[in-house]
Interface confidence: low
């Protein structure tokens, strides 16, 4: 495989043009020494992209996920 495509952190660059409706599922990666890594699998083409954690809907999603975790 091309060395050029392997990153120390899975996400070094983030896509900010991702609609919530086009996301099949999200993966939050706990990678040491890396910024928050959120990988989305897209519905329309099954590709994986790294999503910008600053997206409003992502922040709302994370907030809800954290609230759920602490309520349990």
């Amino acid at each position: 495989k091309p060395v050029s495509l392997s990153y120390r952190c899975p996400c070094r660059f983030f896509e900010s043009h991702v609609a919530r409706a086009n996301v099949k599922h999200l993966k939050i990666l706990n990678t040491p020494n890396c910024a928050l890594q959120i990988v989305a699998r897209l519905k329309n083409n099954n590709r994986q992209v790294c999503i910008d954690p600053k997206l409003k809907w992502i922040q709302e999603y994370l907030e809800k996920a954290l609230n759920k975790r602490f309520k349990m």
Partner: antibody, heavy 124, light 107 residues
Framework: QVQLVQSGGGLVQPGGSLRLSCAAS????????MSWVRQAPGKGLEWVAN????????YYVDSVKGRFTISRDNAKNSLYLQMNSLRAEDTAVYYC?????????????????WGQGTTVTVSS | DIQMIQSPSSLSASVGDRVTITCRAS??????LAWYQQKPGKAPKLLIY???SLESGVPSRFSGSGSGTDFTLTISSLQPEDFATYYC?????????FGQGTKVEIK
């Protein structure tokens, strides 16, 4: 909509220089690898160069190494190809393209968005 | 460099025909292969990536298969708009070489 608009082609003498530009819109330009591909008259496609999102990795086909330089300005959503020491065999239509790689090294997605192409003619 | 050899270099077919184009890599490239369609005077269009994944918006009559060194693009029922030149491209290593192209013409 997602698009790449090219400019900068033309007629140049052998040994001359030319800079091609590619303006991106409709997507997060700074998140993508970008490529240049060319097509000589009546011939097939030839991959020329590509670079990663922040410009720290650049790759070239052997025939242009040392003569062509790929660069980008993420603030301007633009990709460039500086072509020096041009030869007759560089005559071609040049395309810029969005080069899709996923977050993991094993994700290969091809080039899904292309510019309209710009013609470079090297002749005396 | 990895050489990509397409066959045939051209073919004549009729609307409704099943068309198969092959691409052979000079060394193994896993599934790191894409297929493009190009019409005269136009930019290429991505059809298939990762050897067999259909690009969004591409008709389902197009399909790709293969892994390693041998790959196939199939058009299950050729339509008038499919007459064009088709290219494979490997993404396994640099330089990212293309096949020489296969021109699909009307019989």
């Amino acid at each position: 909509q997602v698009q790449l608009v090219q400019s900068g082609g033309g007629l140049v003498q052998p040994g001359g220089s030319l800079r091609l530009s590619c303006a991106a819109s409709g997507f997060t330009f700074s998140s993508y690898w970008m490529s240049w591909v060319r097509q000589a008259p009546g011939k097939g496609l030839e991959w020329v160069a590509n670079m990663n999102q922040d410009g720290s990795e650049k790759y070239y086909v052997d025939s242009v190494k040392g003569r062509f330089t790929i660069s980008r300005d993420n603030a301007k959503n633009s990709l460039y190809l500086q072509m020096n020491s041009l030869r007759a065999e560089d005559t071609a239509v040049y395309y810029c393209a969005r080069d899709l790689t996923g977050p993991y090294y094993y994700d290969y997605y091809g080039m899904d968005v292309w510019g309209q192409g710009t013609t470079v003619t090297v002749s005396s | 460099d990895i050489q990509m050899i397409q066959s045939p270099s051209s073919l004549s077919a009729s609307v409704g025909d099943r068309v198969t184009i092959t691409c052979r890599a000079s060394q193994g490239i896993s599934s790191a292969l894409a297929w493009y369609q190009q019409k005269p005077g136009k930019a290429p269009k991505l059809l298939i990536y990762d050897a067999s994944s259909l690009e969004s918006g591409v008709p389902s009559r197009f399909s790709g298969s293969g892994s390693g060194t041998d790959f196939t693009l199939t058009i299950s029922s050729l339509q008038p708009e499919d007459f064009a030149t088709y290219y494979c491209q490997q993404f396994n290593s640099y330089p990212r070489t293309f096949g020489q192209g296969t021109k699909v013409e009307i019989k």
